[in-house]
Amino acid sequence: QDPWAAEPRSACGPSSCYALFPRRRTFLEAWRACRELGGDLATPRTPEEAQRVDNLVGAGPASRLLWIGLQRQARQCQLQRPLRGFTWTTGDQDTAFTNWAQPATGGPCPAQRCVALEASGEHRWLEGSCTLAVDGYLCQFGFEGACPALQDEAGQAGPAVYTTPFHLVSTEFEWLPFGSVAAVQCQAGRGASLLCVKQPEGGVGWSRAGPLCLGAGCSPDNGGCEHECVEEVDGHVSCRCTEGFRLAADGRSCEDPCAQAPCEQQCEPGGPQGYSCHCRLGFRPAEDDPHRCVDTDECQIAGVCQQMCVNYVGGFECYCSEGHELEADGISCSPAGAMGARASQDLGDELLDDGEDEEDEDEAWEAFGGGWTEMPGILWMEPTQPPDFALAYRPSFPEDREPQIPYPEPTWPPPLSAPRVPYHSSVLSVTRPVVVSATRPTLPSAHQPPVIPATHPALSRDHQIPVIAANYPDLPSAYQPGILSVSHPAQPPAHQPPMISTRYPELFPAHQSPMFPDTQVAGTQTTTHLPAIPPNRAPLVTTLGAHQPPQAPDAPVLRTQATQLPIIPTAQPSLTTSSRSPVSPAHQVSVPAATQPPALPTLLPSQSPTNQTSPISPTHPHSKVPQIPREDGPSPKLALWLPSAAPTAAPTALGEASLAEHIQRDDRWL
């Protein structure tokens, strides 16, 4: 079968599938397409995974290329490392396999690059411009187990047709991911439909054992079944319910599983439990209970806004600092006379490509629940779990169209309470001055309804929110960042967008690239995103400066003595990387221990300025933070860096503040 036929094709193993989509896309478009189906761009990290990719791609034309999930920021060459400074879109640089087309050569790496796989020959890895639309892309889908393909039976009219949770339909699968459906047509005219489900005894298996095409006994009275009657192998009958219903306790009648309103927002019949819960756009299922929905903090998605982002229940908005105004795309900021521009992003505006109907802006604002976020130049997203196919997967949608998801209905958030404790909260209290706005700030908008400040008792000392004041010494006023108001009930003045700032002991040369940001910290309906920090700089956290807006009585000021602790490398076994070479067969390349970064349990992404001597490798499982690619648009002129959290007891050091990124990037992280 020609992999370059119009239809996608896939190859599955017991725990993951690769799928080839022969559709011309840019890297960002390909990344989005995989994510929309619940997967990611392919990350073949081992020779075994690479072999599966080879088998899937086959012997294609030399002129065709397929995106895989490797991307590198500008000036992030690390030629001594197996991935050469490239990072998997899942957020790490771990690999036991590489297949570069050429040996590494020195160079400044001035532009961002993405990796495509040659469709022909050895399927070598080539780097190139992320904005080029190459011929196709490879997605990877992980899941909790798989069912083996069904054996053909004598009474079958043809091979079983399988539909995967990621919408691929084929008769060719060897393994079927959990959540797949098998349709078997029998010569007698009847058919059977099976689901790959979790088994009570553990593992996964087909919802029904074979043989599937035998038996009789439904003719009298439909076998006593309310909906469908199925004749089993041993002659007895089983009752089934049509789509949207499940079998009642009596085994014969059918009931609507959504009738009892088991879901907080949206219920859809089907799936192993008989129903699946879905959340409206702007919400996501709660981790502890998939029946409930919690607000998605879109401001945690890297690059959602160029400068500042405010999250509210069910949506978010972008803002620009004083002297800048929001461009028509609702994301970018450009210098102008106007101040405090904003545009509502009701999730579907920018994150989804095709336009859905905009929610009324007034309604959207009624749902406002807090928090300004100053966006750094590049951000990393929190890890996302693969979809749980114990819940029914989304219905398929036509190629090149986004799923039409209804907008959330606005609701007022509950009164403000003590901040939610973020992951690694005990660490954060030691290592990172968390800046969280606990106000619902007045937003400069003609469309905004009155904001009623939430009143609440003073927070206990454990939950008080530090305020960091700041100055950049010896900077022209054009480069001076503003100050973020982090007072509790006080509202920022109209047309004055709040900002964050921190005093830095020095500024660093413009040619040094900024660090990749750290994982984000969640507050009460509010998040301030703080990027990662390179080692060897101590933070200077000071009391409030002259530019500080008036403080409310319960807004504490953080007074901290910064301690600089050395980062002590620990031993790490050398990573053995299998590398294919264009001139020799696959062989093992042992990377010398000297080139290995220390195996610190860190949340810092490993990219760092090229002059940093001890890059930290994200080998800790919590460090695999997915990245979101971004194309187009200039980088911010000034990146603001604050100390970051790491799961250690020691404070991390202060990052480099880079004034530059004047060069427009090839593409950027979202």
Epitope: W4, A62, W100, E127, G128, T131, D667
Partner: antibody, heavy 124, light 108 residues
């Protein structure tokens, strides 16, 4: 060595058709996409369309509204470009070019080899 | 369509001079830009691909830089054989190539 050799100059009347050829040598013909461009006197180059010899996949510039057809004779390693309903403004030098696949470990869509060009004159 | 604007259109220079030609794109094209040299009656020759990568066999006096919307071709020390027409090309929305109008280098 890689070469693209184009057919000789043509003089046509308005309304007529012209079919130009581009013979490739020195490489595996089915491994590289062939593009056609043209350059009218004093004007910049203009992309017309491409063909992929691997599977005869073609894409054309909408500007030519169905007037252009690109075909192949794979056995002769030759690509053809036919332009119909000629008008005086179609007077130009027509180029075929090979799109590169990869250079030194980079993939890129620039043209690494060009034909010498064919002058087509449309005049009544 | 993405428009490419080259400047200057003409340049009179001498052997040994340093020459810089610029190419501006009407929108962000990343690094999907190539530079070509064309002599009268001859086929164009690829000099630079992906904005800054020198093509095989191209002398080191030719260099390219830029990303986004502004790109430059630099000839560090002009040689007699370098007097020719130079043009840029973008291919970010492949296959819809667009080209600059060209810069003619003449001997002063």
């Amino acid at each position: 060595q890689v070469q693209l050799v184009q057919s000789g100059p043509e003089v046509k009347k308005p309304g007529a058709s012209v079919k130009l050829s581009c013979k490739a040598s020195g490489y595996t013909f089915t491994d590289y996409v062939i593009h056609w461009m043209r350059q009218a006197p004093g004007q910049r180059l203009e992309w017309m369309g491409y063909i992929n010899p691997y599977d005869d996949d073609t894409t054309y510039n909408q500007k030519f509204k169905g007037r252009v057809t690109i075909t192949l004779d794979t056995s002769a390693s030759t690509a053809y470009m036919e332009l119909n309903s000629l008008r005086s403004e179609d007077t130009a030098v027509y180029y075929c070019a090979r799109r590169g696949n990869s250079y030194d470990g980079y993939f890129d869509y620039s043209m690494d080899y060009w034909g010498q060009g064919t002058l087509v004159t449309v005049s009544s | 369509d993405i428009q490419l604007t080259q400047s200057p259109k003409f340049m009179s220079t001498s052997v040994g001079d340093k020459v810089t030609i610029t190419c501006r794109a009407s929108q962000n094209v990343g690094t999907a830009v190539a530079w070509y040299q064309q002599k009268p009656g001859k086929a164009p020759k690829l000099l630079i691909y992906s904005a800054s990568n020198r093509y095989t066999g191209v002398p080191s006096r030719f260099s390219g830089s830029g990303s986004g919307t502004e790109f430059t071709l630099t000839i560090s020390s002009l040689q007699p054989e370098d007097f020719a027409n130079y043009f840029c090309q973008q291919y970010t929305n492949y296959p819809m190539y667009t080209f600059g109008q060209g810069t003619k280098l003449e001997i002063k």
